[in-house]
């Protein structure tokens, strides 16, 4: 669902974020502390353009625990 060149929009984007971020939750716009000024928000980046798993993970609310 998030291969190169594919777009994720609407409910598919919401569901994918919920899966990727799991219990961490997610933002549709990155918190200002983690965003550069040109950050567009995930709808812009994944629906209007295409995105990958790494980009999706940047919208999760807290970093994944490293084992």
């Amino acid at each position: 669902a998030y291969g190169p060149g594919e777009t994720l929009c609407g409910g598919e984007l919401v569901d994918t974020l919920q899966f990727v971020c799991s219990d961490r939750g997610f933002y549709f716009s990155r918190p200002s502390s983690r965003a550069n000024r040109r950050s567009r928000g995930i709808v812009e980046e994944c629906c209007f353009r295409s995105c990958d798993l790494a980009l999706l993970e940047t919208y999760c609310a807290t970093p994944a625990k490293s084992e």
């Epitope: 609407g10 984007l13 812009e44 209007f48």
Partner: antibody
């Protein structure tokens, strides 16, 4: 109150272009995406695309790629939809509609519609 | 592209009737299904979003249910102002697509 007011009816010849406007009021214009949907006479609803009024980014239905351009003017809280190379089957009522959230929960406020007639 | 199919169309009913309209998606769309009412010469009006959530200001006689591929819109007791055309719309992926509409007519 929240409302979207569209420009008036247009009559165009095949091959021409039309530009429809949609002026928003009663809410923060840049906080909601805006869709364009059309409806041919006696037919159903067809999604054309969406614009983010904040940055101006767009996403168009593949069917309209290359013929449609959606723009916005934040100073007047207005979005525009221009359709080029018009054909007779572009005759329709064109609506702007506000996105609820994330393209996932529908369109909650609609303009009154703009009738575009394409005829030679 | 996700295809949306509505039935029946048209639908004949009387005031006070319980009316059910169905909508089927060509693939699973989870609960990302919205319902609209449209009267002649007017813009559509959002009734139900996310399959079962009632839009603000919409009478409680309208309800929605379903998930995956099969959805229903129910009007518990049809009122004179409910005679209109109803459309379902999937918001799972783009292009956003609508059903063909169900016209609710007076029997």
């Amino acid at each position: 109150q929240v409302q979207l007011v569209q420009s008036g009816a247009e009559v165009k010849k095949p091959g021409a272009s039309v530009k429809v406007s949609c002026k928003a009021s009663g809410y923060t214009f840049t906080s909601y995406y805006m869709h364009w949907v059309r409806q041919a006479p006696g037919q159903g609803l067809e999604w054309m695309g969406i614009i983010n009024p904040s940055g101006g980014s767009t996403s168009y239905a593949q069917k309209f790629q290359g013929r449609v351009t959606m723009t916005r003017d934040t100073s007047t809280s207005t979005v525009y939809m221009e359709l080029s190379r018009l054909r007779s089957d572009d005759t329709a009522v064109y609506y702007c509609a506000r996105d609820v959230q994330w393209l996932a929960y529908g369109m909650d406020v609609w303009g009154q519609g703009t009738t575009v007639t394409v005829s030679s | 592209r996700i295809q949306m199919t509505q039935s029946p169309s048209p639908l004949s009913a009387s005031v006070g009737d319980r009316v059910t309209i169905t909508c089927r998606a060509s693939q699973s769309i989870s609960s990302y299904l919205n319902w609209y009412q449209q009267k002649p010469g007017k813009a559509p009006k959002l009734l139900i979003y996310a399959a079962s959530s009632l839009q603000s200001g919409v009478p409680s006689r309208f309800s929605g249910s379903g998930s995956g591929t099969d959805f229903t819109l129910t009007i518990s007791s049809l009122q004179p102002e409910d005679f209109a055309t109803y459309y379902c719309q999937q918001s799972y992926s783009t292009p956003l697509t609508f059903g063909g509409g169900t016209k609710v007519e007076i029997k």
